[in-house]
Interface confidence: low
């Protein structure tokens, strides 16, 4: 840093004073010098460094009529909105005759009520769950001691006694307010008041109680909700996207979920109007007067297969001598699962019913025993899944084959010997 030389007497007749104040204060430092000849430009130093962008004004007053007479020069440095960065030692600096002269120092200090660098923030927490709050304040003057308050009640016996920048709260059972007081030699500043809203804990142990093709009954264990009773729980179900799109922690489903509300207790819900034999993901959240818990992770579940809801369609049955040809089409009604095949039953008047498993084919040729003179022969067909048989079709009478009718080529199915019936 520049320094004055002892070769000449200092031109300074007035040195900067001292300023001590609180943040935001506006003040002025002033120095005055008397010089002969052309007035020099006055610069300002802070802690030995030239302030290149100083907010300073310089006033020059001649003491005589000649330019070479003495001049009084006054430089004023304005400090607006005092900050910590403004503090330090201030001096005026002039260059006179190739010599540097520096005034005596003045000092700018920051001293006032504590200033918050960080204050507690509003947040939501699950009941009885630990969390931390932060508060940070500075002077000067230091030290700054913090005192935390919960619902306006101090958490320590005196400022500085107890946690300082970070308050660890082991858990709350009711919505509470927290603030911190910052104390120093000048007094006390109080932070904003943070509201910590206590929400229910995430429900646990979401599981299936029972399954039907179009409904699932699920149950869960509620989490703690503090002093606030749960008002309801909300269950969401979404079609699984072949395992894609919903990961364990994904916050939102890939499509609009089916949402149901459950009164509690009991913590159980029957979720209806589902598709049979379909994978879903489900999750649950519970709500108190303070708000909802977080959702559980998505739980993969699946509705079981059901039986087909309708019989095969367009059944036709024709007879030609000792053979009968039957064909049909897949049911139009929902299968509620994977079609495993068809069952066929035929029966004549006063004869026992014959039941056959046709598999997945949609036609069959029956080799009838006897001369084929049995009367009122009827055929019924049903589709089946792993869950069982769907409804049987209405009995279709076996019509005599007329010449000109197509006779499809197909595998002949020999009627089983037992049970069987024959015509005399």
């Amino acid at each position: 840093a520049p320094r004055g030389t002892q070769a000449e007497e200092s031109p300074f007749v007035g040195n900067p004073g001292n300023i001590t104040g609180a943040r935001g204060l506006t003040g002025t430092l002033r120095c005055q010098l008397q010089v002969q000849g052309e007035p020099p430009e006055v610069h300002w130093l802070r802690d030995g460094q030239i302030l290149e962008l100083a907010d300073s004004t310089q006033t020059q007053v001649p003491l005589g009529e000649d330019e070479q007479d003495d001049w009084i020069v006054v430089s004023q440095l304005r400090i607006t909105s005092l900050q910590l960065s403004d503090t330090g030692q201030y001096q005026c600096l002039v260059f006179l005759g190739h010599q540097t002269f520096v005034s005596q120092p003045g000092y700018v200090g920051l001293e006032g009520l504590p200033y918050f660098l960080e204050e507690p923030e509003d947040r939501t927490v699950a009941a009885n769950t630990p969390f931390n709050l932060s508060c940070q304040a500075q002077g000067p003057p230091e030290p700054v001691d913090l005192l935390w308050l919960q619902d306006a009640v101090p958490l320590a016996t005196a400022p500085g006694h107890g946690p300082q920048r970070s308050l660890h709260v082991p858990g709350l059972n009711k919505t509470s307010s927290f603030s911190c007081e910052a104390h120093n030699a000048k007094g006390v500043t109080t932070s904003r008041t943070a509201t910590i809203t206590v929400l229910p804990q995430q429900p646990r142990n979401l599981h299936l109680v029972s399954r039907q093709p179009t409904e699932l009954e699920v149950a869960w264990t509620p989490g703690l909700s503090g002093i606030y009773p749960l008002t309801h729980c909300t269950l969401q179900a979404v079609l699984s996207d072949d395992g894609m799109g919903i990961q364990a922690g994904e916050p939102d489903p890939p499509e609009e979920p089916l949402t149901s509300q459950a009164s509690v207790p009991p913590h159980q819900l029957r979720l209806g109007s589902l598709h049979p034999h379909t994978p879903y993901h489900i999750r649950v959240a519970c709500t108190s007067s303070q708000g909802p818990s977080s959702w559980t992770h998505w739980l993969p579940v699946e509705t079981p297969e059901g039986v087909p809801l309708g019989p095969p369609e367009n059944i036709s049955a024709t007879r030609n001598g000792s053979q009968a040809f039957v064909h049909w089409q897949e049911p139009r009604a929902p299968l509620q699962g994977t079609l495993l095949g068809y069952r066929l039953a035929y029966q004549g008047q006063d004869t026992p019913e014959v039941l056959m498993d046709i598999g997945l084919r949609q036609e069959v040729t029956l080799e009838l025993q006897g001369d084929g003179s049995v009367s009122n022969l009827t055929v019924c067909v049903a589709a089946y899944t792993a869950a069982g048989d769907g409804p049987w079709s209405l009995p279709v009478p076996l019509e005599a084959w007329r010449p000109g009718q197509a006779q499809p080529v197909h595998q002949l199915v020999k009627e089983p010997s037992t049970p069987a019936f024959s015509w005399p």
């Epitope: 030290p143 700054v144 001691d145 016996t157 500085g160 006694h161 946690p163 300082q164 970070s166």
Partner: antibody, heavy 117, light 107 residues
Framework: EVNLVESGGGLVQPGGSLKLSCATS????????MYWVRQTPEKRLEWVAY????????YYPDTVKGRFTISRDNAKNTLYLQMSRLKSEDTAMYYC??????????WGQGTSVTVSS | DIVMTQSHKFMSTSVGDRVSITCKAS??????VAWYQQKPGQSPKLLIY???TRHTGVPDRFTGSGSGTDYTLTISSVQAEDLALYYC?????????FGSGTKLEIK
């Protein structure tokens, strides 16, 4: 994991001096007030000194006031205890400890100080 | 200075028993009381602060209670590993003072 490790203890003559150190890790040292506590050979625990998180406030009981000085270097995460004009009754295991609600939630393993001629 | 008195220097108990260790302050300390456990060859460990708040990781068989001048540390079902010295401390006013300790012995 919070860890406090004391060092600097040893045998010293009455009237002598000793400086204890406590190196810390696993937590933000500058956020916490710190303690020195000692345990006499008879297993009595005595509070020796404490210092505020910024180092601006220090407190001592009358038994050590004027002889012991607590200090800290937040840049080095280290706590110190400068002991001078030691007496035989200062013989003890010296522990540094972290303050939590003004209780000591973590302690070091201790360093032994013996004052004897 | 506030004096913390632990009247029992020794207490003998059996595994599974319930035991209560008491501490009396010479003046009201407004529940600013901590309890420490010191096992042989180890440094003290914090169990309870503010009279009844259990420190992180402390088994729930340890509970603290009391107000005014009388405070109690209760172990609901003593385990073999609970053999130790137990100290109370007031953190109400400087100088912070400790009780003289109660040694828990397992029969």
């Amino acid at each position: 994991e919070v860890n406090l490790v004391e060092s600097g203890g040893g045998l010293v003559q009455p009237g002598g001096s000793l400086k204890l150190s406590c190196a810390t890790s696993g937590f933000t040292f500058s956020d916490y007030y710190m303690y020195w506590v000692r345990q006499t050979p008879e297993k009595r625990l005595e509070w020796v000194a404490y210092i505020s998180n910024g180092g601006g406030s220090t407190y001592y009981p009358d038994t050590v006031k004027g002889r012991f000085t607590i200090s800290r270097d937040n840049a080095k995460n280290t706590l110190y205890l400068q002991m001078s004009r030691l007496k035989s009754e200062d013989t003890a295991m010296y522990y540094c400890a972290r303050l939590h609600f003004y209780a000591m939630d973590y302690w070091g393993q201790g360093t032994s100080v013996t004052v004897s001629s | 200075d506030i004096v913390m008195t632990q009247s029992h220097k020794f207490m003998s108990t059996s595994v599974g028993d319930r035991v209560s260790i008491t501490c009396k302050a010479s003046q009201d300390v407004s529940t600013a009381v901590a309890w420490y456990q010191q096992k042989p060859g180890q440094s003290p460990k914090l169990l309870i602060y503010w009279a009844s708040t259990r420190h992180t990781g402390v088994p729930d068989r340890f509970t603290g209670s009391g107000s005014g001048t009388d405070y109690t540390l209760t172990i609901s079902s003593v385990q073999a590993e609970d053999l130790a010295l137990y100290y109370c401390q007031q953190h109400y006013n400087t100088p912070f003072t400790f009780g003289s300790g109660t040694k828990l012995e397992i029969k």
